[in-house]
Interface confidence: low
């Protein structure tokens, strides 16, 4: 009985972009300005997201889909659906509570976002360091020391002086 009733529900005929208006005898009414319904059979329309401040509009709201935001230059998106914008830093830096700071020795960041990370430890994979790491680049691992021809040298990266992202103590 329940299933039959739901199949006959007049609201199920209301397409996306409309809502089933109880105040008007369940007539399908268009979503008001700045609102949308992305599926049929909705009893209300959702308010469109507004991209303000550091957010900018990537896709305008329509009657059937919400607006999509991204971030103004110098910022990048975080979270599902770009729920937040965070300041960019340069490569070789990380964002701290005090702003952008250079990566500590033994760590790198090859992106404008995120944290400084420790150089790859080539020896864990039985390899040697072909190219030293920098603040902007990870070390490059090469063949294992045993695979190197006699007389060839390999560079071993020094241990990090301290780890990235320390809290101010």
């Amino acid at each position: 009985f329940e299933r039959t009733r739901s199949l006959q529900d007049p609201c199920s005929n209301c397409p996306a972009g409309t809502f089933c208006d109880n105040n008007r005898n369940q007539i399908c009414s268009p979503c008001p300005p700045n609102s949308f319904s992305s599926a049929g059979g909705q009893r209300t329309c959702d308010i469109c997201r507004q991209c303000k401040g550091v957010f900018r509009t990537r896709k305008e709201c329509s009657s059937t889909s919400n607006a999509e935001c991204d971030c103004t230059p110098g910022f990048h998106c975080l979270g599902a659906g770009c729920s937040m914008c965070e300041q960019d830093c340069k490569q070789g830096q990380e964002l701290t509570k005090k702003g952008c700071k250079d990566c500590c020795f033994g760590t790198f960041n090859d992106q404008k976002r995120g944290i400084c990370r420790p150089w790859t430890n080539c020896s864990l994979d039985g390899k040697s360091v072909l190219v030293n790491g920098t603040k902007e680049r990870d070390v490059v691992c090469g063949p294992s020391p045993a695979d190197l021809s006699p007389g060839a040298s390999s560079v071993t990266p020094p241990a990090p002086a301290r780890e990235p992202g320390h809290s101010p103590q």
Partner: antibody, heavy 116, light 111 residues
């Protein structure tokens, strides 16, 4: 829409290997590290390692060193996690998760069952 | 064994406030501001609720807040609602070879 879509459930025998994929969409694939985190039935979350999709560099938890390999294919915006020498205690849901300084986007999870 | 210690369970009535603790060491929670909290409903993937100790992603209710003192981080949920019932995990960056660690999880029951 930003999302991570993982491959389907797997059933493996002890000693075998499994390779799980995680396809990213809706953002710049090479701009964010990707991690793998697993969760055994009824248990907590366990970090396995990360891959830098930009360089291919990896960092694995000590527990998984020698058994796990993380790779990426930038042409398809996909990361892979291969775990070898499977044992029954590897039965778990395996999640990929995007990272900036926390895991802000997660895949839906891939159930891997190891059973003889 | 989880590296970060959380209570196995906490409970509260609707409208109340609860706090979940997450105790680590000077190698993880005590040294880094990269502490995050995740909510996980049964059969679902975890969801980020708090990052960088106390920052809340937009879309997450302001009833959720985070803090840290020494080696212990805390998640506080005020005005408990039925939908808050879930497992909660803390996580921190660490200086050990395991770069990220999780707590064992706390089951929150809304009475």
């Amino acid at each position: 829409e930003v999302q991570l879509v993982e491959s389907g459930a797997e059933v493996k025998k002890p000693g075998a290997s499994v390779k799980v994929s995680c396809k990213a969409s809706g953002y710049t694939f090479t701009g964010y590290y990707m991690h793998w985190v697993r969760q055994a039935p009824g248990q907590g979350l366990e970090w396995m390692g990360w891959i830098n999709p930009n360089s291919g560099g990896t960092n694995y938890a000590q527990k998984f060193q020698g058994r796990v390999t993380m790779t990426r294919d930038t042409s398809t915006s996909t990361v892979y996690m291969e775990l070898s020498s499977l044992r029954s205690e590897d039965t778990a849901v395996y999640y990929c998760a995007r990272d900036i300084r926390a895991f802000d986007i997660w895949g839906q999870g891939t159930m891997v069952t190891v059973s003889s | 064994q989880p590296v970060l210690t959380q209570p196995a369970s906490v409970s509260g009535s609707p409208g109340q406030s609860i706090t979940i603790s997450c105790t680590g060491t000077s190698s993880d929670v005590g040294s880094y501001n990269f502490v995050s909290w995740y909510q996980q409903h049964p059969g679902k993937a975890p969801k980020l609720m708090i990052y960088d100790v106390s920052n809340r992603p937009s879309g997450v209710s302001d009833r959720f807040s985070g803090s840290k003192s020494g080696n212990t981080a805390s998640l506080t949920i005020s005005g408990l609602q039925a939908e808050d019932e879930a497992d909660y995990y803390c996580s921190s960056y660490t200086s050990s070879s395991t770069r990220w660690v999780f707590g064992g999880g706390t089951k929150l029951t809304v009475l």
